[in-house]
Interface confidence: low
Amino acid sequence: ECVTKLFTDTGFQGGDVTTIFSPSAKHCQLICTHHPRCLLFTFMADSSSEDPTRWFTCILKDSVTETLPRVNMTGAISGYSFKQCPHQISACHRNLYVDLDMKGMNYNSLMTRDAQECQERCTNDVHCHFFTYATRQFPSTEHRNICLLKYTHMGTPTRIMKLTKVVSGFSLKSCALSKLACIRDIFPSTAFADSNIDSVMAPDVFVCRRICTHHPGCLFFTFLSQEWPKESERNLCLLKTSESGLPSTRIKKDRALSGFSLQTCRHSVPVFCHSSFYHDTDFLGEELDIVDVKGHEACQKMCTDSIRCQFFTYSPSPESCNGGKGKCYLKLSSNGSPTKILHGRGGISGYTLRLCKMDNVCTTKIKPRIVGGEASVHGEWPWQITLHITSPAQRHLCGGSIIGNQWILTAAHCLIGLESPKILRVYSGILNQSEVKKDTAFFGVQEIIIHDQYEMAESGYDIALLKLETAMNYTDAQRPICLPSKGDRSVIYAECWVTGWGYRKLGDKIQNTLQKANVPLVTTEECQTRYRGHKITNKMLCAGYQEGGKDACKGDSGGPLSCKHNDVWHLVGITSWGEGCGQRERPGVYTNVVEYVDWILEKTQAV
């Protein structure tokens, strides 16, 4: 059960896993969520005790029953991890803490203009986990404007004290804001000789890299493959660091692979979610439960649905036995990784998928596309919504796309002249308009945000956000699409689809079933030659065939132009305008979403 509420003046009794220091209950909850074992926590605020050494302690807890007895405790704040929640979770923590000194290893001291610059310096320093900045009002003159960069083994402070006129905060590397070099190469037959800060078992080098990426102290790693000569060291993932931040020595070692943490990469990468299956592989760990299920996928689902399960091994039965069901061993460990990995025993192993929501949920795979045909099927475009207007009579108005659990992206021209968001309804998980009846669940719209430079579709800025009144739970039928990457990957979209319930041709009517059309992107220059009377800007993009035929039309407006890259769907365009529908040499014109990513983030994070 997902509990987001925090309980003030309340403590949870027992179940302690570990204690760390945290500047706030919200940060403590974030740490609990990312900790492999923590299900609940108690945070001791600065009013919680006569003893200042207990202030700002964050006690991470676990319980077989997923809850613990609550007791009255002055100044304590308790709550549950977000592991139990369906919504997306980010490790990014931007808050600044005034009059708090977060203690750690002060390894660098520099002068900065303000706390924001200090935070930026921390984000762009490979070792920095958090910082404390002495403001210009700080009592000691020689320390004013001094920015102390700090690190600890755990990435969290070793103590937190109240100190007037200082500001503390965390590195924003987890917000993908670092400018440090991002090295994605995996180096075969290579071992890095630097000191190990930790070692865990991993089934392959990519899981090892993901573990390194979200381990606070790991900067690079060496993975000893299953062919490694020394049996006891096979599948060992050695997490490493060095004073310089990069490997000092590399050794040529067969059957070892090495690489770097992706913590400084400027795009969202799946670092928590290990979705692969490992055949003929057994994961050892503390056994949580054994259940009979049909197939390894069902076993993974079982593990994902069991909140304490971290990984599993499925042992298939011969087809003739037990109705084809096998044994599903649900397991856990202190660090979330198997205690040992064995090969050649016939098991199929993998990890819980509940950590996938800590990565961007939009990156998870969806049902395979049905090739050919113009009608879509259920779950094919789970981000597509139908936006209805209820006055004077209820009808489909425009399309839109889910980009967050409370946010829909659509076209500005759909919303111009609406007197109130109250007459809008968002229906998600819908394939046929006929599914929309009086009692069909919908999301009300709390707020309409139209780009303030919008005048008319043909001039650009045809983009708007709808904030939903309530947050959406993601399912296979309704979930977000990724915004296009502003990060550091080459993106040339080869497969793009436009979807909607719009007309099939001018003068037609709204379609019942969601239609889809595969359309190629057209260069701006090419598009400009087709629309001589309009200025096709870099904030627009065009798609369609020279011979016409497949195109968006009336009623599709605001809907997505979805393009697939590296198995992930991106919202590349918003259906905006065009000359006719599917006319020869008249491609559809779309809002170029990548040019508005900053605007989208600014609006969705500010409200």
Epitope: I183, S244, R250, R266, K486, V491, I492, D598
Partner: antibody, heavy 116, light 107 residues
Framework: QVQLEESGPGLVAPSQSLSITCTVS????????IYWVRQPPGKGLEWLGM???????DYNSALKSRLSISKDNSKSQVFLKMNSLQTDDTARYYC??????????WGQGTTLTVSS | DIVMTQSHKFMSTSVGDRVSITCKAS??????VAWYQQKPGQSPKLLIY???YRNTGVPDRFTGSGSGTDFTFTISSVQAEDLAVYYC?????????FGGGTKLERL
């Protein structure tokens, strides 16, 4: 395949401004940083600045006040603008793709002469 | 900004010789140093990155070493086609910066 090509005015008078375009193909500008380097005749390489895939910029401190780098992702073009040119800005100007690991690509460069 | 200094502007060598070019950084750049080769009329070509990693297709006579502030680029057996200018560059932190270059010429 990956290609970068610089185009510039060739000759500019002192105190005037410079605008050089780097047109890329084979990859998307939303995905990679592009940096600018110049080389005066018979001299070494000087790193001028760069624009990241997400549009943020970094500049050589000594030239920051005169430099501006921008881009148009849809046209696959990056622009270097430099004002108050002097004769010692005479150089060959290169654009290069920022590499991650071992991938590195440079344009052939465009020659700029600052002279009255 | 980080300043990269190559102490030798010129170095003389013969075919078959072993030659080492040094580069010093004004502050710790970890091992994020690259080495470029430039021949007359050509764009620079990346040989080594992250101090010791050879770029694809670069012969193994070219090696790099060092960390922190002191770096060395070595050609174990100079070939005629190696006569060129060599530059070090720090790619630890923007703004990236180059050394002044070392011209390798025939003795």
């Amino acid at each position: 395949q990956v290609q970068l090509e610089e185009s510039g005015p060739g000759l500019v008078a002192p105190s005037q401004s410079l605008s050089i375009t780097c047109t890329v193909s084979g990859f998307s500008l939303t995905g990679y940083g592009i940096y600018w380097v110049r080389q005066p005749p018979g001299k070494g390489l000087e790193w001028l600045g760069m624009i990241w895939g997400d549009g943020r910029t970094d500049y050589n401190s000594a030239l920051k006040s005169r430099l501006s780098i921008s881009k148009d992702n849809s046209k696959s073009q990056v622009f270097l603008k430099m004002n108050s040119l002097q004769t010692d800005d005479t150089a060959r100007y290169y654009c290069a793709r920022d590499y991650y690991g071992s991938k590195d690509y440079w344009g052939q460069g465009t020659t700029l002469t600052v002279s009255s | 900004d980080i300043v990269m200094t190559q102490s030798h502007k010129f170095m003389s060598t013969s075919v078959g010789d072993r030659v080492s070019i040094t580069c010093k950084a004004s502050q710790d750049v970890s091992t994020a140093v690259a080495w470029y080769q430039q021949k007359p009329g050509q764009s620079p070509k990346l040989l080594i990155y992250l101090t010791s990693y050879r770029n694809t297709g670069v012969p193994d006579r070219f090696t790099g070493s060092g960390s922190g502030t002191d770096f060395t680029f070595t050609i174990s057996s100079v070939q005629a086609e190696d006569l060129a200018v060599y530059y070090c560059q720090q790619h630890y932190k923007t703004p990236y910066s180059f050394g002044g270059g070392t011209k390798l010429e025939r003795l």
